[in-house]
């Protein structure tokens, strides 16, 4: 038996740094969708009511408690009749997979904020990305949310060669040894080693010494 006409399918959570959107199929014809998400009291909260989109931004709900495991469902209604129901007296609906933001949100591509050379040492700083998670009316950074669960890996190499070295840190800073007179290039990756899925971000854009971001001091 196929999916009944109008019923949503392929419900998928798309989440990066806690910005979280539920997507589904198909594009509606003669019907609309309404999304519900279960809150921490296990009540269903209505979102994106009567939409003809096939996505719904649920960020403002999931950031209330990023450690909570959420479930959503997409309800289908004939166009212009939000009261219309299926044969069992309920609207057609499809449940999403469960989603735990802290464990599953993708780590966004990090950015190298700066690097500074002092003699044969280079200090590399990773930008502490702001998330949409709030506490006490302020937005928390990625580090604020993940704490020591989040590490960064630095890949660095001489501009004149391809041999990469790595360093890791539990903060947003690295301090690496370099050869004097050599230019180096850098890229960083965010990692949550304790995760089973979505453990690593994509690599940051490469930054090289001799370009804008760096500073050199004898």
């Amino acid at each position: 038996a196929g999916t009944p006409p109008g019923k949503a399918f392929n419900l998928t959570w798309i989440s990066t740094d806690f910005k979280t959107i539920l997507e589904w199929q198909p594009k509606p014809t003669n019907y609309t969708y309404t999304v519900q998400i279960s809150d921490r009291s296990r009540n269903w909260k209505y979102k994106c009511t009567g939409t003809t989109d096939t996505e719904c931004d649920l960020t403002d709900e999931i950031v209330k408690d990023v450690n909570w495991t959420y479930e959503a469902r997409v309800l289908s209604y004939p166009a212009g009749n939000v009261e219309s129901t299926g044969s069992a007296g309920e609207p057609l609906y499809e449940n999403s997979p469960e989603f735990t933001p802290y464990l599953e949100t993708n780590l966004g591509q990090p950015t190298i904020q700066s690097f500074e050379q002092v003699g044969t040492k280079v200090n590399v700083t990773v930008e502490d990305e702001r998330t949409l998670v709030r506490r006490n009316n302020t937005f928390l950074s990625l580090r604020d949310v993940f704490g020591k669960d989040l590490i960064y890996t630095l890949y660095y190499w001489k501009s004149s060669s391809s041999g990469k070295k790595t360093a890791k840190t539990n903060t947003n800073e690295f301090l690496i040894d370099v050869d004097k007179g050599e230019n180096y290039c850098f890229s960083v990756q965010a990692v949550i080693p304790s995760r089973t899925v979505n453990r690593k971000s994509t690599d940051s854009p490469v930054e090289c010494m001799g370009q804008e971001k760096g500073e050199f001091r004898e």
């Epitope: 704490g147 960064y152 301090l175």
Partner: antibody, heavy 125, light 108 residues
Amino acid sequence: QVQLQESGPGLVKPSQTLSLTCTVSGGSISSGQYWSWIRQHPGKGLEWIGEIYYSGSTRYNPSLKSRVTISVDTSKNQFSLKLSSVTAADTAVYYCARDAPYYYGGGYYYYMDVWGKGTTVTVSS
Amino acid sequence: EIVLTQSPGTLSLSPGERATLSCRASESVDSSYLAWYQQKPGQAPRLLIYGASTRQTGIPDRFSGSGSGTDFTLTISRLEPEDFAVYYCQQAGVVPYTFGGGTKVEIK
């Protein structure tokens, strides 16, 4: 120089909640360190209970997680431990500690470098 | 959890002698997260070594740490009277952070 001081009742009845506070002096609790609780049963080794960042991000020992809450009050420069449903097995010296970043191998890693003197908590009726 | 086993449980030595303390992990530990602490009776532990081999500021150079993977060692090259205490290794890379059971270095 950062100093830590634990405070709280030395005697707690079984099934009640143990509550301790650690006051940080000589530095800000919001300055990028983590703040930990560790305990030591009489004549025994050390057991890590959990830690908190100034933002409220926590990590707990799974063996105690269902009973432990660690919180932070940045306005008072304090962090606190609550351990519920205590039994005699929770009798121990409780230490608070600072987890600060140290340079190693190209990066920075956290180690417990400043400890309070410890406070003895006895669970007994 | 990672279990750290320290041996021997007690080490009886005289001042001036060399002390070698062992810490063995049940699974591989990243050296970046391995520390050694000293604890004297009635006192809180004190950080001696971090990153398996780096001395904390103010720690005398008679203390040295080494090792990687599952086997780590703390060496006190010449015991001073103030070194008689209990020593703990600790890993802080995997939750729960764990301590070894301790080695007591006592005066012979």
